[in-house]
Protein backbone atom coordinates (compact mmCIF):
# COMPACT_ATOMS: atom_id res chain seq x y z
CA UNK A 1 0.00 0.00 0.00
CA UNK A 2 1.54 3.35 -1.07
CA UNK A 3 1.36 6.11 1.54
CA UNK A 4 -0.69 9.23 0.73
CA UNK A 5 1.78 12.09 0.33
CA UNK A 6 1.32 15.49 -1.27
CA UNK A 7 2.62 15.95 -4.81
CA UNK A 8 5.77 18.12 -4.91
CA UNK A 9 5.33 21.51 -6.54
CA UNK A 10 5.51 21.44 -10.36
CA UNK A 11 5.33 17.66 -10.56
CA UNK A 12 1.57 17.27 -11.12
CA UNK A 13 1.17 15.17 -14.29
CA UNK A 14 -0.81 16.91 -17.02
CA UNK A 15 -0.54 13.95 -19.35
CA UNK A 16 0.83 10.43 -19.37
CA UNK A 17 4.25 10.73 -20.96
CA UNK A 18 7.85 9.53 -20.70
CA UNK A 19 8.77 12.03 -17.98
CA UNK A 20 6.85 9.80 -15.56
CA UNK A 21 9.48 7.03 -15.71
CA UNK A 22 11.69 9.25 -13.52
CA UNK A 23 9.01 9.53 -10.83
CA UNK A 24 9.45 7.55 -7.65
CA UNK A 25 6.58 5.27 -6.66
CA UNK A 26 5.22 7.73 -4.09
CA UNK A 27 5.42 10.56 -6.64
CA UNK A 28 3.39 8.57 -9.17
CA UNK A 29 0.82 7.90 -6.48
CA UNK A 30 0.62 11.55 -5.48
CA UNK A 31 1.00 13.28 -8.83
CA UNK A 32 -0.88 11.18 -11.39
CA UNK A 33 -4.63 11.68 -11.38
CA UNK A 34 -6.46 8.35 -11.76
CA UNK A 35 -9.05 9.83 -14.13
CA UNK A 36 -6.25 11.17 -16.37
CA UNK A 37 -4.60 7.74 -16.33
CA UNK A 38 -7.90 6.09 -17.29
CA UNK A 39 -8.39 8.37 -20.30
CA UNK A 40 -4.77 7.99 -21.48
CA UNK A 41 -4.25 4.28 -20.85
CA UNK A 42 -3.25 3.78 -24.47
CA UNK A 43 -0.03 5.72 -23.78
CA UNK A 44 1.13 3.53 -20.90
CA UNK A 45 2.30 0.74 -23.20
CA UNK A 46 4.65 3.04 -25.07
CA UNK A 47 6.45 4.07 -21.86
CA UNK A 48 9.05 1.75 -20.26
CA UNK A 49 7.65 1.76 -16.73
CA UNK A 50 9.19 -0.59 -14.17
CA UNK A 51 7.08 -3.36 -12.64
CA UNK A 52 6.97 -1.37 -9.40
CA UNK A 53 5.66 1.70 -11.24
CA UNK A 54 3.03 -0.42 -12.99
CA UNK A 55 1.91 -1.65 -9.57
CA UNK A 56 1.25 1.97 -8.58
CA UNK A 57 -0.72 2.66 -11.77
CA UNK A 58 -2.81 -0.46 -11.20
CA UNK A 59 -3.48 0.64 -7.62
CA UNK A 60 -4.74 4.02 -8.86
CA UNK A 61 -7.13 2.35 -11.31
CA UNK A 62 -8.35 -0.04 -8.60
CA UNK A 63 -9.20 2.93 -6.38
CA UNK A 64 -11.01 4.71 -9.21
CA UNK A 65 -12.95 1.60 -10.26
CA UNK A 66 -13.50 -0.60 -7.17
CA UNK A 67 -16.35 -2.47 -8.92
CA UNK A 68 -14.20 -3.34 -11.95
CA UNK A 69 -12.71 -1.42 -14.86
CA UNK A 70 -14.87 -0.19 -17.74
CA UNK A 71 -14.19 -1.71 -21.14
CA UNK A 72 -12.72 1.58 -22.46
CA UNK A 73 -9.89 1.14 -19.94
CA UNK A 74 -9.58 -2.64 -20.26
CA UNK A 75 -9.04 -2.39 -24.01
CA UNK A 76 -5.92 -0.27 -23.49
CA UNK A 77 -4.39 -2.03 -20.49
CA UNK A 78 -1.57 -3.50 -22.53
CA UNK A 79 1.20 -4.84 -20.30
CA UNK A 80 -0.68 -3.69 -17.23
CA UNK A 81 -2.95 -6.69 -17.93
CA UNK A 82 -0.13 -8.95 -16.71
CA UNK A 83 -0.49 -7.31 -13.29
CA UNK A 84 -4.16 -8.26 -13.00
CA UNK A 85 -5.27 -11.15 -10.83
CA UNK A 86 -8.10 -13.53 -11.78
CA UNK A 87 -10.10 -11.85 -8.97
CA UNK A 88 -9.66 -8.45 -10.68
CA UNK A 89 -10.72 -9.88 -14.03
CA UNK A 90 -13.85 -11.50 -12.59
CA UNK A 91 -15.18 -7.98 -11.95
CA UNK A 92 -14.92 -7.04 -15.62
CA UNK A 93 -17.58 -7.12 -18.29
CA UNK A 94 -15.72 -7.65 -21.58
CA UNK A 95 -18.02 -7.72 -24.61
CA UNK A 96 -15.83 -6.54 -27.49
CA UNK A 97 -13.79 -9.05 -29.48
CA UNK A 98 -11.29 -6.25 -30.11
CA UNK A 99 -10.70 -5.93 -26.37
CA UNK A 100 -10.18 -9.67 -26.09
CA UNK A 101 -7.70 -9.65 -28.98
CA UNK A 102 -5.77 -6.73 -27.50
CA UNK A 103 -5.30 -8.52 -24.19
CA UNK A 104 -4.47 -11.89 -25.74
CA UNK A 105 -1.80 -10.11 -27.79
CA UNK A 106 -0.08 -9.05 -24.55
CA UNK A 107 0.21 -12.69 -23.47
CA UNK A 108 1.14 -13.98 -26.95
CA UNK A 109 3.74 -16.71 -27.06
CA UNK A 110 3.18 -17.74 -23.45
CA UNK A 111 1.16 -20.57 -21.95
CA UNK A 112 -2.42 -19.70 -21.09
CA UNK A 113 -2.18 -17.99 -17.71
CA UNK A 114 -4.91 -18.09 -15.03
CA UNK A 115 -5.60 -14.44 -15.94
CA UNK A 116 -6.15 -15.28 -19.61
CA UNK A 117 -8.31 -18.30 -18.72
CA UNK A 118 -10.48 -16.09 -16.49
CA UNK A 119 -10.70 -13.39 -19.16
CA UNK A 120 -11.82 -15.91 -21.80
CA UNK A 121 -14.33 -17.43 -19.39
CA UNK A 122 -15.82 -13.99 -18.63
CA UNK A 123 -15.96 -13.12 -22.32
CA UNK A 124 -17.60 -16.38 -23.43
CA UNK A 125 -20.12 -16.32 -20.57
CA UNK A 126 -21.00 -12.74 -21.49
CA UNK A 127 -21.67 -13.76 -25.08
CA UNK A 128 -23.67 -16.80 -24.05
CA UNK A 129 -21.92 -19.10 -26.52
CA UNK A 130 -18.65 -19.66 -28.34
CA UNK A 131 -19.45 -18.04 -31.68
CA UNK A 132 -17.30 -18.52 -34.78
CA UNK A 133 -15.37 -15.22 -34.53
CA UNK A 134 -14.49 -15.84 -30.89
CA UNK A 135 -13.41 -19.41 -31.60
CA UNK A 136 -11.34 -18.19 -34.56
CA UNK A 137 -9.58 -15.69 -32.32
CA UNK A 138 -9.00 -18.06 -29.43
CA UNK A 139 -7.65 -20.93 -31.51
CA UNK A 140 -5.35 -18.51 -33.37
CA UNK A 141 -3.72 -17.55 -30.05
CA UNK A 142 -4.08 -20.95 -28.36
CA UNK A 143 -4.43 -23.89 -30.78
CA UNK A 144 -5.21 -26.20 -27.85
CA UNK A 145 -7.97 -23.96 -26.52
CA UNK A 146 -10.90 -26.08 -27.67
CA UNK A 147 -9.51 -29.18 -26.00
CA UNK A 148 -9.05 -27.29 -22.73
CA UNK A 149 -12.83 -26.95 -22.41
CA UNK A 150 -14.97 -29.47 -20.54
CA UNK A 151 -17.66 -31.39 -22.44
CA UNK A 152 -20.20 -29.19 -20.61
CA UNK A 153 -18.53 -26.01 -21.90
CA UNK A 154 -18.29 -27.44 -25.41
CA UNK A 155 -22.05 -27.98 -25.36
CA UNK A 156 -22.52 -24.25 -25.86
CA UNK A 157 -20.49 -24.20 -29.11
CA UNK A 158 -22.96 -23.66 -31.97
CA UNK A 159 -22.42 -25.94 -34.99
CA UNK A 160 -21.70 -22.89 -37.19
CA UNK A 161 -18.54 -22.20 -35.12
CA UNK A 162 -17.07 -25.56 -36.11
CA UNK A 163 -16.06 -24.04 -39.46
CA UNK A 164 -13.35 -22.15 -37.56
CA UNK A 165 -11.77 -25.35 -36.19
CA UNK A 166 -8.54 -26.61 -37.79
CA UNK A 167 -7.31 -30.23 -37.43
CA UNK A 168 -4.46 -29.14 -35.14
CA UNK A 169 -6.96 -27.52 -32.77
CA UNK A 170 -8.22 -31.03 -31.94
CA UNK A 171 -4.83 -32.68 -31.37
CA UNK A 172 -5.15 -32.79 -27.59
CA UNK A 173 -8.89 -33.50 -27.38
CA UNK A 174 -9.91 -36.65 -25.53
CA UNK A 175 -12.78 -38.95 -26.60
CA UNK A 176 -15.28 -37.23 -24.28
CA UNK A 177 -14.64 -33.90 -26.01
CA UNK A 178 -14.88 -35.43 -29.49
CA UNK A 179 -18.19 -37.02 -28.46
CA UNK A 180 -19.58 -33.49 -28.06
CA UNK A 181 -17.83 -31.91 -31.05
CA UNK A 182 -18.52 -34.62 -33.64
CA UNK A 183 -22.31 -34.16 -33.88
CA UNK A 184 -21.76 -30.39 -34.16
CA UNK A 185 -19.32 -30.98 -37.01
CA UNK A 186 -21.80 -33.36 -38.63
CA UNK A 187 -24.45 -30.62 -38.53
CA UNK A 188 -22.00 -27.95 -39.73
CA UNK A 189 -20.76 -29.94 -42.73
CA UNK A 190 -23.98 -31.76 -43.65
CA UNK A 191 -24.36 -30.00 -46.99
CA UNK A 192 -20.88 -30.93 -48.19
CA UNK A 193 -20.27 -34.16 -50.03
CA UNK A 194 -17.59 -36.63 -51.05
CA UNK A 195 -13.92 -36.03 -50.44
CA UNK A 196 -14.47 -32.40 -49.39
CA UNK A 197 -16.72 -33.56 -46.57
CA UNK A 198 -14.31 -36.26 -45.45
CA UNK A 199 -11.41 -33.79 -45.22
CA UNK A 200 -13.50 -31.58 -42.92
CA UNK A 201 -14.99 -34.32 -40.73
CA UNK A 202 -11.90 -36.53 -40.44
CA UNK A 203 -10.39 -34.94 -37.31
CA UNK A 204 -13.71 -35.20 -35.46
CA UNK A 205 -14.37 -38.89 -36.20
CA UNK A 206 -13.39 -40.04 -32.70
CA UNK A 207 -16.99 -39.22 -31.78
CA UNK A 208 -18.68 -40.98 -34.72
CA UNK A 209 -21.31 -43.74 -34.26
CA UNK A 210 -21.27 -47.03 -36.19
CA UNK A 211 -23.93 -45.79 -38.60
CA UNK A 212 -21.74 -42.94 -39.83
CA UNK A 213 -18.75 -45.28 -40.26
CA UNK A 214 -20.96 -47.62 -42.32
CA UNK A 215 -22.02 -44.64 -44.44
CA UNK A 216 -18.40 -43.54 -44.93
CA UNK A 217 -17.49 -47.05 -46.06
CA UNK A 218 -19.80 -46.51 -49.04
CA UNK A 219 -17.95 -43.36 -50.11
CA UNK A 220 -14.42 -44.52 -51.07
CA UNK A 221 -12.83 -42.29 -48.44
CA UNK A 222 -9.64 -44.34 -47.82
CA UNK A 223 -9.38 -43.54 -44.12
CA UNK A 224 -5.81 -43.69 -42.83
CA UNK A 225 -4.88 -45.99 -39.95
CA UNK A 226 -4.11 -43.11 -37.57
CA UNK A 227 -7.73 -41.93 -37.91
CA UNK A 228 -9.09 -45.49 -37.67
CA UNK A 229 -7.17 -46.09 -34.42
CA UNK A 230 -8.84 -43.04 -32.85
CA UNK A 231 -12.39 -44.28 -33.55
CA UNK A 232 -14.57 -45.37 -30.66
CA UNK A 233 -14.15 -49.11 -30.09
CA UNK A 234 -17.90 -49.59 -29.64
CA UNK A 235 -18.47 -47.89 -33.00
CA UNK A 236 -15.95 -50.10 -34.82
CA UNK A 237 -17.04 -53.47 -33.36
CA UNK A 238 -20.29 -53.87 -35.38
CA UNK A 239 -18.54 -53.16 -38.71
CA UNK A 240 -18.17 -56.14 -41.04
CA UNK A 241 -14.86 -57.12 -42.64
CA UNK A 242 -16.18 -55.84 -45.99
CA UNK A 243 -17.11 -52.48 -44.44
CA UNK A 244 -13.70 -52.02 -42.82
CA UNK A 245 -12.02 -52.97 -46.08
CA UNK A 246 -14.06 -50.36 -47.96
CA UNK A 247 -13.54 -47.77 -45.23
CA UNK A 248 -9.74 -48.11 -45.23
CA UNK A 249 -9.26 -48.77 -48.93
CA UNK A 250 -5.54 -49.22 -49.66
CA UNK A 251 -4.74 -48.55 -45.97
CA UNK A 252 -6.36 -51.85 -44.96
CA UNK A 253 -2.88 -53.44 -45.01
CA UNK A 254 -2.03 -51.37 -41.94
CA UNK A 255 -4.40 -53.49 -39.83
CA UNK A 256 -1.68 -56.15 -39.50
CA UNK A 257 0.68 -53.79 -37.69
CA UNK A 258 -2.12 -52.75 -35.32
CA UNK A 259 -3.68 -56.16 -34.66
CA UNK A 260 -2.68 -56.12 -30.98
CA UNK A 261 -4.06 -52.62 -30.31
CA UNK A 262 -7.59 -51.35 -29.74
CA UNK A 263 -9.89 -50.98 -31.58
CA UNK A 264 -8.38 -53.42 -34.13
CA UNK A 265 -7.75 -56.18 -31.56
CA UNK A 266 -11.33 -56.07 -30.25
CA UNK A 267 -12.76 -55.88 -33.77
CA UNK A 268 -10.78 -58.96 -34.89
CA UNK A 269 -12.22 -60.96 -31.97
CA UNK A 270 -15.74 -60.19 -33.25
CA UNK A 271 -15.15 -61.33 -36.86
CA UNK A 272 -15.35 -64.81 -38.36
CA UNK A 273 -11.85 -66.07 -39.10
CA UNK A 274 -12.77 -67.00 -42.67
CA UNK A 275 -13.96 -63.40 -43.27
CA UNK A 276 -10.67 -62.08 -41.91
CA UNK A 277 -8.80 -64.50 -44.17
CA UNK A 278 -10.35 -62.84 -47.24
CA UNK A 279 -8.20 -59.77 -46.48
CA UNK A 280 -5.04 -61.84 -47.02
CA UNK A 281 -3.24 -60.06 -44.19
CA UNK A 282 -2.74 -63.01 -41.86
CA UNK A 283 -4.94 -61.51 -39.15
CA UNK A 284 -5.55 -64.10 -36.41
CA UNK A 285 -7.94 -64.32 -33.48
CA UNK A 286 -11.30 -64.34 -35.23
CA UNK A 287 -14.20 -66.68 -34.44
CA UNK A 288 -13.12 -70.14 -35.66
CA UNK A 289 -14.82 -71.53 -38.73
CA UNK A 290 -17.76 -73.77 -37.90
CA UNK A 291 -18.62 -71.98 -34.67
CA UNK A 292 -22.20 -70.77 -34.38
CA UNK A 293 -22.60 -67.04 -33.73
CA UNK A 294 -25.80 -66.36 -31.81
CA UNK A 295 -27.69 -63.18 -32.60
CA UNK A 296 -28.73 -62.35 -29.04
CA UNK A 297 -31.17 -59.68 -30.18
CA UNK A 298 -33.10 -62.33 -32.14
CA UNK A 299 -33.03 -64.68 -29.16
CA UNK A 300 -34.50 -61.88 -27.02
CA UNK A 301 -37.26 -61.28 -29.59
CA UNK A 302 -38.20 -64.96 -29.66
CA UNK A 303 -38.28 -65.46 -25.89
Amino acid sequence: EVEKTACPSGKKAREIDESLIFYKKWELEACVDAALLATQMDRVNAIPFTYEQLDVLKHKLDELYPQGYPESVIQHLGYLFLKMSPEDIRKWNVTSLETLKALLEVNKGHEMSPQVATLIDRFVKGRGQLDKDTLDTLTAFYPGYLCSLSPEELSSVPPSSIWAVRPQDLDTCDPRQLDVLYPKARLAFQNMNGSEYFVKIQSFLGGAPTEDLKALSQQNVSMDLATFMKLRTDAVLPLTVAEVQKLLGPHVEGLKAEERHRPVRDWILRQRQDDLDTLGLGLQGGIPNGYLVLDLSMQEALS
Partner: antibody
Framework: EVKLVESGGGLVQPGGSLSLSCAAS????????MSWVRQPPGKALEWLGF??????????EYSASVKGRFTISRDNSQSILYLQMNALRAEDSATYYC???????????WGQGTSVTVSS | NIVMTQSPKSMSMSVGERVTLSCKAS??????VSWYQQKPEQSPKLLIH???NRYTGVPDRFTGSGSATDFTLTISSVQAEDLADYYC?????????FGSGTKLEIK
Protein backbone atom coordinates in the same frame (compact mmCIF):
# COMPACT_ATOMS: atom_id res chain seq x y z
CA GLU B 1 -43.37 -28.05 -46.61
CA VAL B 2 -42.37 -31.52 -45.37
CA LYS B 3 -45.37 -33.80 -44.90
CA LEU B 4 -45.70 -37.42 -43.80
CA VAL B 5 -49.15 -39.06 -43.95
CA GLU B 6 -49.69 -42.60 -42.63
CA SER B 7 -52.55 -44.88 -43.61
CA GLY B 8 -53.57 -48.52 -43.37
CA GLY B 9 -54.23 -48.86 -39.65
CA GLY B 10 -57.23 -50.72 -38.26
CA LEU B 11 -58.44 -53.75 -36.32
CA VAL B 12 -56.74 -57.08 -36.97
CA GLN B 13 -56.87 -60.49 -35.27
CA PRO B 14 -53.86 -62.00 -33.45
CA GLY B 15 -51.66 -63.83 -35.95
CA GLY B 16 -52.95 -61.64 -38.77
CA SER B 17 -51.12 -59.24 -41.07
CA LEU B 18 -51.39 -55.54 -41.91
CA SER B 19 -49.54 -53.19 -44.18
CA LEU B 20 -49.07 -49.53 -43.26
CA SER B 21 -48.13 -46.85 -45.78
CA CYS B 22 -46.61 -43.40 -45.36
CA ALA B 23 -46.81 -40.88 -48.18
CA ALA B 24 -43.94 -38.37 -48.04
CA SER B 25 -43.76 -34.99 -49.74
CA UNK B 26 -41.85 -31.71 -49.55
CA UNK B 27 -38.32 -33.17 -49.61
CA UNK B 28 -36.06 -35.40 -51.70
CA UNK B 29 -37.24 -38.76 -50.40
CA UNK B 30 -34.21 -40.78 -51.59
CA UNK B 31 -31.79 -38.60 -49.57
CA UNK B 32 -33.23 -39.59 -46.21
CA UNK B 33 -33.30 -42.52 -43.83
CA MET B 34 -36.94 -43.24 -42.92
CA SER B 35 -38.14 -44.89 -39.76
CA TRP B 36 -41.18 -46.34 -37.99
CA VAL B 37 -41.94 -45.65 -34.32
CA ARG B 38 -44.94 -46.86 -32.33
CA GLN B 39 -46.67 -45.76 -29.14
CA PRO B 40 -49.12 -48.00 -27.24
CA PRO B 41 -51.98 -46.04 -25.63
CA GLY B 42 -50.70 -44.05 -22.64
CA LYS B 43 -47.20 -45.48 -23.00
CA ALA B 44 -43.77 -44.43 -24.26
CA LEU B 45 -42.36 -44.35 -27.78
CA GLU B 46 -40.71 -47.45 -29.27
CA TRP B 47 -38.41 -47.43 -32.31
CA LEU B 48 -39.18 -50.28 -34.70
CA GLY B 49 -36.54 -49.85 -37.37
CA PHE B 50 -35.32 -47.76 -40.27
CA UNK B 51 -34.49 -48.02 -43.93
CA UNK B 52 -31.39 -46.25 -45.17
CA UNK B 53 -31.19 -43.74 -48.01
CA UNK B 54 -30.05 -44.21 -51.61
CA UNK B 55 -26.39 -43.52 -50.80
CA UNK B 56 -26.49 -46.37 -48.29
CA UNK B 57 -28.29 -48.90 -50.42
CA UNK B 58 -31.77 -48.75 -48.85
CA UNK B 59 -30.76 -51.42 -46.31
CA UNK B 60 -32.68 -51.90 -43.04
CA GLU B 61 -32.23 -52.26 -39.28
CA TYR B 62 -34.89 -53.51 -36.85
CA SER B 63 -35.56 -53.63 -33.14
CA ALA B 64 -35.49 -57.09 -31.57
CA SER B 65 -39.21 -56.98 -30.75
CA VAL B 66 -40.24 -56.91 -34.44
CA LYS B 67 -37.25 -58.49 -36.23
CA GLY B 68 -38.44 -61.34 -38.41
CA ARG B 69 -42.12 -60.29 -38.23
CA PHE B 70 -42.08 -56.72 -39.60
CA THR B 71 -40.54 -55.53 -42.86
CA ILE B 72 -39.75 -51.93 -43.80
CA SER B 73 -39.58 -51.07 -47.49
CA ARG B 74 -39.90 -48.01 -49.69
CA ASP B 75 -41.17 -47.07 -53.14
CA ASN B 76 -38.81 -44.29 -54.11
CA SER B 77 -40.59 -43.45 -57.37
CA GLN B 78 -43.74 -42.58 -55.40
CA SER B 79 -42.09 -41.44 -52.15
CA ILE B 80 -43.93 -44.01 -50.05
CA LEU B 81 -42.62 -45.83 -46.99
CA TYR B 82 -44.15 -49.17 -45.98
CA LEU B 83 -44.36 -51.28 -42.86
CA GLN B 84 -45.49 -54.85 -43.49
CA MET B 85 -46.57 -56.43 -40.19
CA ASN B 86 -47.03 -60.20 -39.89
CA ALA B 87 -47.81 -62.56 -36.98
CA LEU B 88 -49.38 -59.70 -35.08
CA ARG B 89 -49.85 -59.93 -31.30
CA ALA B 90 -52.00 -58.03 -28.82
CA GLU B 91 -48.91 -56.15 -27.63
CA ASP B 92 -48.46 -54.70 -31.15
CA SER B 93 -51.55 -52.52 -30.57
CA ALA B 94 -50.39 -48.91 -30.80
CA THR B 95 -50.34 -45.71 -32.82
CA TYR B 96 -47.73 -46.16 -35.56
CA TYR B 97 -45.72 -43.13 -36.70
CA CYS B 98 -43.66 -42.72 -39.82
CA UNK B 99 -40.64 -40.46 -39.23
CA UNK B 100 -37.82 -38.91 -41.22
CA UNK B 101 -34.30 -39.13 -39.78
CA UNK B 102 -31.98 -36.15 -40.01
CA UNK B 103 -28.19 -36.17 -40.06
CA UNK B 104 -27.83 -37.17 -36.38
CA UNK B 105 -30.52 -39.86 -36.78
CA UNK B 106 -32.97 -37.84 -34.71
CA UNK B 107 -36.55 -37.88 -35.98
CA UNK B 108 -37.14 -34.39 -37.32
CA UNK B 109 -40.55 -34.96 -38.93
CA TRP B 110 -43.38 -37.19 -37.78
CA GLY B 111 -46.63 -38.19 -39.43
CA GLN B 112 -49.94 -37.81 -37.64
CA GLY B 113 -49.94 -41.54 -36.77
CA THR B 114 -52.24 -44.41 -37.64
CA SER B 115 -53.88 -46.64 -35.04
CA VAL B 116 -53.48 -50.44 -35.06
CA THR B 117 -55.51 -52.66 -32.74
CA VAL B 118 -54.76 -56.37 -32.48
CA SER B 119 -57.63 -58.16 -30.82
CA SER B 120 -59.88 -61.14 -31.27
CA ASN C 1 -30.10 -52.57 -25.61
CA ILE C 2 -29.32 -49.14 -24.23
CA VAL C 3 -31.85 -48.14 -21.58
CA MET C 4 -32.79 -44.48 -21.27
CA THR C 5 -34.09 -43.57 -17.82
CA GLN C 6 -35.99 -40.29 -17.41
CA SER C 7 -36.77 -38.45 -14.20
CA PRO C 8 -38.99 -37.26 -12.75
CA LYS C 9 -41.99 -39.20 -14.10
CA SER C 10 -44.11 -36.05 -13.81
CA MET C 11 -43.82 -32.51 -12.51
CA SER C 12 -46.10 -29.54 -11.96
CA MET C 13 -44.65 -26.07 -12.48
CA SER C 14 -45.87 -22.48 -12.52
CA VAL C 15 -45.50 -20.24 -15.57
CA GLY C 16 -42.12 -18.49 -15.51
CA GLU C 17 -40.36 -21.18 -13.45
CA ARG C 18 -37.18 -22.96 -14.56
CA VAL C 19 -37.66 -26.64 -15.38
CA THR C 20 -34.95 -29.31 -15.47
CA LEU C 21 -35.63 -32.76 -16.93
CA SER C 22 -33.09 -35.55 -16.59
CA CYS C 23 -32.23 -38.48 -18.83
CA LYS C 24 -29.63 -41.16 -18.07
CA ALA C 25 -28.30 -43.70 -20.56
CA SER C 26 -27.21 -47.17 -19.42
CA UNK C 27 -24.13 -46.90 -21.68
CA UNK C 28 -22.04 -44.12 -23.19
CA UNK C 29 -24.02 -42.73 -26.15
CA UNK C 30 -21.68 -39.83 -26.86
CA UNK C 31 -23.88 -36.86 -27.70
CA UNK C 32 -26.40 -38.83 -29.74
CA VAL C 33 -29.38 -37.87 -27.61
CA SER C 34 -32.49 -36.06 -28.81
CA TRP C 35 -35.37 -34.53 -26.89
CA TYR C 36 -38.96 -34.62 -28.16
CA GLN C 37 -42.06 -32.79 -27.02
CA GLN C 38 -45.45 -34.47 -27.38
CA LYS C 39 -48.46 -32.30 -26.63
CA PRO C 40 -51.80 -34.00 -25.82
CA GLU C 41 -53.33 -35.72 -28.88
CA GLN C 42 -50.40 -34.69 -31.12
CA SER C 43 -47.37 -36.33 -32.72
CA PRO C 44 -43.97 -35.79 -31.09
CA LYS C 45 -41.84 -32.81 -32.19
CA LEU C 46 -38.03 -32.64 -32.20
CA LEU C 47 -36.64 -30.02 -29.78
CA ILE C 48 -32.94 -30.85 -29.36
CA HIS C 49 -30.60 -33.10 -31.33
CA UNK C 50 -26.97 -34.00 -30.71
CA UNK C 51 -27.61 -33.43 -26.95
CA UNK C 52 -27.19 -29.66 -27.06
CA ASN C 53 -28.24 -28.39 -30.48
CA ARG C 54 -31.61 -26.67 -30.68
CA TYR C 55 -33.61 -27.81 -33.69
CA THR C 56 -34.73 -25.18 -36.23
CA GLY C 57 -37.58 -23.00 -34.98
CA VAL C 58 -37.45 -24.22 -31.36
CA PRO C 59 -37.71 -21.33 -28.84
CA ASP C 60 -34.44 -20.52 -27.09
CA ARG C 61 -35.95 -21.16 -23.66
CA PHE C 62 -35.27 -24.85 -24.43
CA THR C 63 -31.64 -25.88 -23.81
CA GLY C 64 -30.05 -29.32 -23.93
CA SER C 65 -26.80 -30.32 -22.28
CA GLY C 66 -24.78 -33.35 -21.27
CA SER C 67 -22.76 -36.11 -22.90
CA ALA C 68 -21.85 -39.78 -22.39
CA THR C 69 -24.56 -40.99 -19.98
CA ASP C 70 -26.11 -37.92 -18.30
CA PHE C 71 -28.34 -35.52 -20.20
CA THR C 72 -30.55 -32.59 -19.26
CA LEU C 73 -33.31 -30.60 -20.93
CA THR C 74 -33.84 -27.18 -19.35
CA ILE C 75 -36.79 -24.87 -19.97
CA SER C 76 -35.56 -21.50 -18.65
CA SER C 77 -39.00 -19.96 -18.17
CA VAL C 78 -41.86 -22.39 -18.64
CA GLN C 79 -44.92 -21.24 -20.61
CA ALA C 80 -48.50 -22.54 -20.54
CA GLU C 81 -48.04 -24.01 -24.03
CA ASP C 82 -45.16 -26.20 -22.77
CA LEU C 83 -47.67 -28.59 -21.15
CA ALA C 84 -46.64 -31.90 -22.74
CA ASP C 85 -44.83 -35.20 -22.37
CA TYR C 86 -41.06 -34.95 -22.97
CA TYR C 87 -39.07 -37.91 -24.24
CA CYS C 88 -35.34 -38.37 -24.64
CA UNK C 89 -34.02 -40.85 -27.18
CA UNK C 90 -30.62 -42.18 -28.19
CA UNK C 91 -29.54 -42.72 -31.79
CA UNK C 92 -25.95 -43.79 -31.08
CA UNK C 93 -26.52 -47.48 -31.60
CA UNK C 94 -29.46 -49.58 -32.70
CA UNK C 95 -31.90 -50.47 -31.54
CA UNK C 96 -32.54 -46.77 -31.01
CA UNK C 97 -34.33 -46.35 -27.70
CA PHE C 98 -36.48 -43.78 -25.90
CA GLY C 99 -36.98 -42.94 -22.25
CA SER C 100 -40.36 -43.53 -20.65
CA GLY C 101 -41.11 -39.79 -20.66
CA THR C 102 -41.66 -36.92 -18.22
CA LYS C 103 -45.14 -35.40 -18.01
CA LEU C 104 -44.97 -31.63 -17.48
CA GLU C 105 -48.09 -30.08 -16.00
CA ILE C 106 -48.66 -26.37 -15.54
CA LYS C 107 -50.13 -25.13 -12.24
Amino acid sequence: EVKLVESGGGLVQPGGSLSLSCAASGFTFTDYYMSWVRQPPGKALEWLGFIRNKANGYTTEYSASVKGRFTISRDNSQSILYLQMNALRAEDSATYYCTRLEVLYAMDYWGQGTSVTVSS
Amino acid sequence: NIVMTQSPKSMSMSVGERVTLSCKASENVGSYVSWYQQKPEQSPKLLIHGASNRYTGVPDRFTGSGSATDFTLTISSVQAEDLADYYCGQSYSYPYTFGSGTKLEIK
